[in-house]
C-alpha cells in the first residue's frame, strides 16, 4: 500500500493510473466503501463523502489513463486509506496529515521557551526534527521543546515529519524579542555627553509597553531609577525622570537616551526593561558606563577612570609621540613633576585606545591648560 | 557500555576518496547526532560535519563542502564519512562523536567520541 | 563562523599549583562552552559542558565558569593525570568550533 503524507491546511494529489492511456470509468472511495467521487464519460460526479466540497480531480488528465483524486485545505481527519477502482483493479494509497504549531505565540522574548507540537492521525508514530535558524536541531516524537530562546533563534524554523519513511517539512516563523545588544558599554571623558542607544532586534506593527532604565552607579550604595517611559505604537513618551542626572530621550524608536554629560558619580551600570503589551516577562539590556578625568594638582598629574572596567584594561600617561611613563592595571595612575608638553591619558585594551584624554602641562611658572 | 568503535587506519593516494565508518552500541543510535572531527598531526581539533541519522539531514563546514559525505546506516547503528578528492593536508585522525539532544541546548556537548581513524594521504 | 580563542596556547605547571586556561568567542554565545581534555595519541574527554557543568565521572578539581564571550577552565590542585592539551568548543550555532588549544606541561 502507498503511503502519501500531507499537511493540515495544504492540497494532496493522489494518483491513479490505468493502463490503458484513455479516459474510462474510475471511481474513489474512502476505507468505508463511501464514494468520494468518480466520473461519468467525462463528467466529474461526487459521492456523500464528509469530502464533499474539497475533493477534486483534473479531468485534462483523464485521457492520458490518469484519474488523480485532490484533497484540499487537509484536516487531520482526512487520514485514511483511499481506494481507487478502475479496470477492475484496486489501488489504495494510505493518507496521512500532520499538522505543527507553536503552542503559545510566535513572538516570544530571548530567553523563553517554545514548545511545537504535532498533530497526527491516530494509530500513527512519527518522528519530527526541528531545525532552528542557527543550526540547532531538537529531535522527538509529538511535542518538541526548547527550553530558552536565543536572538539567533528568530526566522524560520525547518520542521521535518518522518512516517513510515517519508517525510513532510513544514516551516515556522518564530520572532524572538529582544534587543540588539544584551550588554554594551560608553567610555567618555569628563564633561562630554553621553549617548545611550537600546535598538530593537525585531520589527512588529504596533509595538506598545512600558520601560525603565535603572542605574547603579560606582559611587553609590543603591541603584535608583533614572527614567520611566511608555511607548505607545512605537512612539516613545517619558514618565518620569530624575532631576539628577537629567536624561533625555528621543521620541522615535530605537530608544535613545543622552546623558548630558558623563560626570564620575555618574559612571557605573545601567538595566534598560521593557515590558511589552500582552507578553509575560521583560527585555534586558545591559548598559555602562566609564568616564575618565585628568588633571594637574600642583606637581602631581593623575588620570583616573570610573565605572566598571575589566581587570585586563590598561591605563597609562604618557608624553606625547613618547614611551609611556606609568602604564598599570589600575583605575588611576600619576606622575610626579611632569615635563612640559601635551601629556595623553590612555584606556587601552590589549593595545586598542578605548579612551583618551588630553591635558597640557605648562612650564612651572604657569598654571595647566585642559584642551 | 555506550561505545563508538571505527573501521581501521587507511593509506591513500592523493586524488581519491576515503570512508571511514563509526559503529554505535550500548544506546539507541537514532536518538543522538553523529559529528565527524579531525586532527592532524600536532594541530587543534577541526569541525568537519554532523548527521541526524534517523532523517539524515547534515550539516558540513564550509571548508569541506562538496568533499565531504556523511551518511548513516540505521539497520547497522553505523555512521560514514567518506572525504574526495584527497590531498597531503588530508594527513589527520578522524573522529566520530556522539551529541545528545536536550531541550535545553546549552548541554549540547560530544560525549562519546570514537578512537580515531588515522589517514595518511602520501604518493 | 564563531571564532573561539584560547590563552595561553602552552603553560608549565607543578603538581599541586591552580591552574586557568581562557577562552573568548567572536561574538556572544550565551553559555554554549565545551571543555575537552585531550593526551597523546587519545581521543578528546569532555570535561565540562553549557561552561560550568562537570560531565559525570570527572573530578570537581575541574570547573568551567563564564557566559557572553569570555569563559575560563580552572584546575584547582593540578595532579599527574592533568597533564595534556585542552580544547574550548562552542556549541551556539553550526559550524561549530574549537579554540586551538592549550597545553599544559610538566615544569
Known amino acids: 500500500k502507498k503511503v502519501v503524507l500531507g499537511k493540515k491546511g495544504d492540497t494532496v494529489e493522489l494518483t491513479c493510473t490505468a493502463s490503458q492511456k484513455k479516459s474510462i470509468q474510475f471511481h474513489w472511495k474512502n476505507s468505508n466503501q463511501i464514494k468520494i467521487l468518480g466520473n461519468q464519460g467525462s463528467f466529474l460526479t461526487k459521492g456523500p463523502s464528509k469530502l464533499n466540497d474539497r475533493a477534486d480531480s483534473r479531468r485534462s488528465l483523464w485521457d492520458q489513463g490518469n484519474f488523480p483524486l485532490i484533497i484540499k485545505n487537509l484536516k487531520i481527519e482526512d487520514s485514511d486509506t483511499y481506494i481507487c477502482e478502475v479496470e477492475d483493479q484496486k489501488e489504495e494509497v494510505q493518507l496521512l496529515v500532520f499538522g505543527l504549531t507553536a503552542n503559545s505565540d510566535t513572538h516570544l522574548l530571548q530567553g523563553q521557551s517554545l514548545t511545537l507540537t504535532l498533530e497526527s492521525p491516530p494509530g500513527s508514530s512519527p518522528s519530527v526534527q526541528c531545525r532552528s535558524p542557527r543550526g540547532k536541531n531538537i529531535q522527538g516524537g509529538k511535542t518538541l521543546s526548547v527550553s530558552q530562546l536565543e536572538l539567533q533563534d528568530s526566522g524560520t524554523w525547518t520542521c521535518t515529519v518522518l512516517q513510515n519513511q517519508k517525510k513532510v517539512e513544514f516551516k515556522i516563523d518564530i520572532v524572538v524579542l529582544a534587543f540588539q545588544k544584551a550588554s554594551s558599554i560608553v567610555y567618555k571623558k569628563e564633561g562630554e555627553q553621553v549617548e545611550f542607544s537600546f535598538p530593537l532586534a525585531f520589527t512588529v506593527e504596533k509595538l506598545t509597553g512600558s520601560g525603565e532604565l535603572w542605574w547603579q552607579a560606582e559611587r553609590a550604595s543603591s541603584s535608583k531609577s533614572w527614567i520611566t517611559f511608555d511607548l505607545k505604537n512605537k512612539e516613545v513618551s517619558v514618565k518620569r525622570v530624575t532631576q539628577d542626572p537629567k536624561l533625555q530621550m528621543g521620541k522615535k524608536l530605537p530608544l535613545h537616551l543622552t546623558l548630558p554629560q558623563a560626570l564620575p558619580q555618574y559612571a557605573g551600570s545601567g538595566n534598560l526593561t521593557l515590558a511589552l503589551e500582552a507578553k509575560t516577562g521583560k527585555l534586558h539590556q545591559e548598559v555602562n558606563l566609564v568616564v575618565m578625568r585628568a588633571t594637574q594638582l600642583q606637581k602631581n598629574l593623575t588620570c583616573e577612570v570610573w565605572g566598571p572596567t575589566s581587570p585586563k584594561l590598561m591605563l597609562s600617561l604618557k608624553l606625547e609621540n613618547k614611551e609611556a611613563k606609568v602604564s598599570k592595571r589600575e583605575k588611576a595612575v600619576w606622575v610626579l613633576n611632569p615635563e612640559a608638553g601635551m601629556w595623553q591619558c590612555l584606556l587601552s585594551d590589549s593595545g586598542q585606545v578605548l579612551l583618551e584624554s588630553n591635558i597640557k602641562v605648562l612650564p612651572t611658572w604657569s598654571t595647566p591648560v585642559q584642551p | 557500555q555506550v561505545q563508538l568503535v571505527q573501521s581501521g587506519a587507511e593509506v591513500k593516494k592523493p586524488g581519491s576518496s576515503v570512508k571511514v565508518s563509526c559503529k554505535a552500541s550500548g544506546y539507541t543510535f537514532t536518538s543522538y547526532d553523529i559529528n565527524w572531527v579531525r586532527q592532524a598531526p600536532g594541530q587543534g581539533l577541526e569541525w568537519m560535519g554532523t548527521i541526524t541519522p534517523i532523517f539524515g539531514t547534515t550539516d558540513y563546514a564550509q571548508k569541506f563542502q562538496g568533499r565531504v559525505t556523511i551518511t548513516a546506516d540505521e539497520s547497522t547503528s553505523t555512521a560514514y564519512m567518506e572525504l574526495s578528492s584527497l590531498r597531503s593536508e588530508d594527513t589527520a585522525v578522524y573522529y566520530c562523536?556522539?551529541?545528545?539532544?536536550?531541550?535545553?541546548?546549552?548541554?549540547?556537548?560530544?560525549?562519546?567520541w570514537g578512537q580515531g581513524t588515522l589517514v595518511t594521504v602520501s604518493s | 563562523d564563531i571564532q573561539m580563542t584560547q590563552s595561553p596556547s602552552s603553560l608549565s605547571a607543578s603538581v599541586g599549583d591552580r591552574v586557568t586556561i581562557t577562552c573568548r568567542a567572536s561574538q556572544s554565545i550565551s553559555s554554549y562552552l565545551n571543555w575537552y581534555q585531550q593526551k597523546p595519541g587519545k581521543a578528546p574527554k569532555l570535561l565540562i559542558y553549557a561552561a560550568s557543568t562537570l560531565q559525570s565521572g570527572v573530578p570537581s578539581r575541574f570547573s568551567g565558569s563564564g557566559s557572553g564571550t569570555d569563559f575560563t577552565l580552572t584546575i584547582s590542585s593540578l595532579q599527574p593525570e592533568d597533564f595534556a592539551t585542552y580544547y574550548c568548543?562552542?556549541?551556539?550555532?553550526?559550524?561549530?568550533?574549537f579554540g586551538q588549544g592549550t597545553k599544559v606541561e610538566i615544569k
Open positions: 568548543q562552542q556549541s551556539y550555532s553550526i559550524p561549530y568550533t
Open positions: 562523536a556522539r551529541e545528545g539532544y536536550s531541550s535545553s541546548w546549552h548541554d549540547d556537548a560530544f560525549d562519546i
